[in-house]
């Protein structure tokens, strides 16, 4: 048994860490494998991971940290029973991938602009909950080229776009995604999409 | 309710050994791990070692010779062992509840204060 | 083993005052640093975590800073129930304390 893909790992930078590797075949990772973690530096103890499988030869596992610090370093140790696979290790704060925003709703009854708000899916003390920013995704079920990405570069966890902008009596979803530019983040998954029916007053038009 | 409670002699003659049982409850020894710290009267906190959840065990390297921390899961009880007391062991002894990876304590017993006499 | 420096040992203040504790490590802890309070004859509380984490149940106006060898524990306001000994602690092995600040009433 054998690491064909060494484990590579992300942190929400809150609770959870998922790291993923590949195996050289079809493998049972729950009962095959252990992934042991143990934070560097300071008194603390190793922990266990069960992994699930992510795939036939695939493996994923499921890290809980109760919090992050930047300074967090965490060796990480790959078993097979008695028979050390792999070792590595792994620091949370170079490796972030934020939580996805939730509670994404559409407004369509502020006059004729839409306002789309989401929740930031930290807590106030967390460090990414003042250092969120989004993209929003919205685009047309019925025309797949009716695509558009609206940057959010401020903190606040909405956005105004004209009802206009988009076309009138047809059907729109909109998700949203984040990231963090201060730990150099990859984007988070999206959020569940939303979906409404994009109708306006056309002006009237004098001839 | 999470409540940690200390219990063992409150007088030791020097050489002996002092035994201390930390009983839990509100929470799962399988789950967290358990420091000791002590204090001595009018002096700062000492840390003496820690079970994790695991049974694994970390020493201050200044009293590991003489103590040893066991457990009970099944009765919720930890136990700290420390051979040959001195009057300079005497101190309020505290167990308390480590708080997730941190080992930092978030539940005390309300300790007990352990003479070292003849 | 890595030596923490509380400073002062003992204070005295009022109520409504700004009160600032200091805590200085022997080396870099970066922010494995967490604050206590203790009363005559009480178990230590846990006020504060990760250097600033503010524990659960703890009042707003204590607050955490500092990284590497320099710390502080800051009470906005101080009120009378807050007039304790205050203790840092690191959590490199083995673990050590602050020889304790105490804060009196003026």
């Known amino acids: 048994m054998k690491v064909l893909q060494e484990p590579t790992c992300v942190s929400d930078y809150m609770s959870i860490s998922t790291c993923e590797w590949k195996m050289n075949g079809p493998t049972n990772c729950s009962t095959e494998l252990r992934l042991l973690y143990q934070l560097v530096f300071l008194l603390s103890e190793a922990h266990t991971c069960i992994p699930e499988n992510n795939g036939g030869a695939g493996c994923v596992c499921h890290l809980l940290m109760d919090d992050v610090v930047s300074a967090d370093n965490y060796t990480l140790d790959l078993w097979a029973g008695q028979q050390l696979l792999w070792k590595g290790s792994f620091k949370p704060s170079e490796h972030v991938k934020p939580r996805a925003p939730g509670n994404l709703t559409v407004h369509t009854n502020v006059s004729d602009t839409l306002l789309l708000t989401w929740s930031n899916p930290y807590p106030p003390d967390n460090y990414l909950y003042n250092h969120l920013t989004y993209a929003v995704n919205i685009w047309s079920e019925n025309d797949p080229a009716d695509f558009r990405i609206y940057n959010v570069t401020y903190l606040e966890p909405s956005l105004r776009i004209a009802a206009s902008t988009l076309k009138s009596g047809i059907s729109y979803r909109a998700r949203v995604r984040a990231w963090a530019q201060c730990y150099n983040t990859t984007w988070s998954e999206w959020s569940p999409s939303t979906k409404w029916h994009n109708s306006y007053r056309e002006p009237f038009e004098q001839h | 309710e999470v409540t940690l409670k200390e219990s063992g002699p409150v007088l030791v003659k020097p050489t002996e050994t002092l035994t201390l049982t930390c009983t839990v409850s509100?929470?799962?020894?399988?789950?967290?791990?358990v420091h000791w710290i002590r204090q001595p009267p009018g002096k700062a906190l000492e840390w003496l070692g820690v079970?994790?959840?695991?049974?694994?065990?970390d020493y201050n390297a200044a009293f590991k010779s003489r103590l040893t921390i066991s457990k009970d899961n099944s009765k919720s009880q930890v136990v700290l062992t420390m051979t040959n007391m001195d009057p300079v062991d005497t101190a309020t002894y505290y167990c308390?509840?480590?708080?997730?990876?941190?080992?930092?304590?978030?539940?005390w017993g309300q300790g007990t204060t352990v003479t070292v006499s003849s | 083993d890595i030596q923490m420096t509380q400073s002062p040992s003992s204070l005295s203040a009022s109520v409504g005052d700004r009160v600032t504790i200091t805590c200085r490590a022997s080396?870099?802890?970066?922010?494995?640093l967490a604050w206590y309070q203790q009363k005559p004859g009480k178990a230590p509380k846990l006020l504060i975590y990760?250097?600033?984490t503010l524990a659960e149940g703890v009042p707003s106006r204590f607050s955490g800073s500092g990284s590497g060898t320099d710390f502080t524990l800051t009470i906005s306001s101080l009120q009378p129930e807050d007039f304790a000994t205050y203790y840092c602690?690191?959590?490199?092995?083995?673990?050590?304390f602050g020889q304790g600040t105490k804060l009196e009433i003026k």
């Open positions: 308390a509840r480590n708080k997730g990876t941190r080992p930092v304590f978030d539940y």
């Open positions: 509100g929470f799962s020894l399988t789950n967290y791990g």
């Open positions: 079970i994790w959840s695991g049974g694994s065990t």
């Open positions: 080396e870099n802890i970066y922010s494995y």
């Open positions: 990760n250097a600033k």
């Open positions: 602690q690191h959590y490199v092995s083995p673990l050590t």
